[in-house]
């Protein structure tokens, strides 16, 4: 199977490496602008230079390239716990992260939230804590897992799935009810 | 274009229970994750509640656990904020997002909906 290339991947492949081809004129083939610059002006003819221009701050372009404008930088988003890990530069995009003991919860794609941890309280770490993934927890008995911390088999109602896992606790808890004083 | 509509704001007394509902003008509002988010006087905005697309996982933020609780109606198009235990810091303007890279910039935000506990 051939990718479908959209119009501008068709015109740049006319071109060798490095080079695009002149939106204007097809028989001219010009330099990409370096990471870090923008195209400014396209070269005026054959051989001669591609007006490029250095990104202004609070933008970059992280690949050479012949857009008519740097990228904007991303911002880290302080409301989903996000860090700045380094700030953007001309070739580079702000990198952001989460703070140490936390781990990314993606939402989607690009959009990642920094929960903390789980300690595995009353339980066992089965599996640790690693950047994308929570730690993974193993409760002991008379604990059940419910959003990765153990809670304790009082708090497990009949129609939930704990039931298996805190049987022999929800029959003691049935037995002293059914046991009434005399 | 996307729209969210916050309602169910108001003053309620310290300990007292309020329900804040989000609706979405858009159809494929049940393929995305959404959040409730809020912003006190003179801070910056917070984490509140957070609901996957099909409802089944929930994550909150540490001071609200056990009294708050995020819902959400597919068929309505409407997430919830049931909030319970309400303590006078919880005052603040509360807003949901749609938590996709797509659409989380705060041009997509509703107006928000006033909170405010008195004690």
């Known amino acids: 199977l051939v990718p479908h290339l959209g119009d501008r991947e068709k015109r740049d492949s006319v071109c060798p490496q490095g080079k695009y081809i002149h939106p204007q004129n097809n028989s001219i083939c010009c330099t990409k602008c370096h990471k870090g610059t923008y195209l400014y002006n396209d070269c005026p003819g054959p051989g001669q230079d591609t007006d490029c221009r250095e990104c202004e701050s609070g933008s970059f372009t992280a690949s050479e390239n012949h857009l008519r404008h740097c990228l904007s930088c991303s911002k880290c988003r302080k409301e989903m716990g996000q860090v700045e890990i380094s700030s953007c530069t001309v070739d580079r995009d702000t990198v952001c992260g989460c703070r140490k003991n936390q781990y990314r919860h993606y939402w989607s794609e690009n959009l990642f939230q920094c929960f903390n941890c789980s300690l595995c309280l009353n339980g066992t770490v089965h599996l640790s804590c690693q950047e994308k993934q929570n730690t993974v927890c193993t409760c002991h008995a008379g604990f059940f897992l419910r959003e990765n911390e153990c809670v304790s088999c009082s708090n497990c109602k009949k129609s939930l799935e704990c039931t298996k896992l805190c049987l022999p606790q929800i029959e003691n808890v049935k037995g002293t009810e059914d046991s009434g004083t005399t | 274009q996307v729209q969210l509509q916050e309602s169910g704001g108001g003053l309620v007394q310290a300990g007292g229970p309020l329900r804040l509902s989000c609706a979405a003008s858009?159809?494929?509002?049940?393929?995305?994750?959404m959040g409730w988010f809020r912003q006190a006087p003179g801070k910056e905005r917070e984490f509140v509640a957070a609901?996957?697309?099909?409802?089944?996982?929930?994550y909150y933020a540490d001071s609200v656990k056990g009294r708050f609780t995020i819902s959400r109606d597919n068929a309505k198009n409407t997430v919830y904020l049931q909030m319970n235990s309400l303590k006078p810091e919880d005052t603040a303007v509360y807003y949901c997002?749609?938590?996709?890279?797509?659409?989380?910039?705060?041009?997509?935000w509703g107006q928000g909906t006033q909170v405010t506990v008195s004690s």
């Open positions: 858009w159809r494929t509002f049940s393929s995305y994750a």
């Open positions: 997002a749609v938590l996709h890279e797509d659409l989380y910039e705060y041009d997509y």
């Open positions: 609901i996957s697309w099909s409802g089944g996982s929930t």
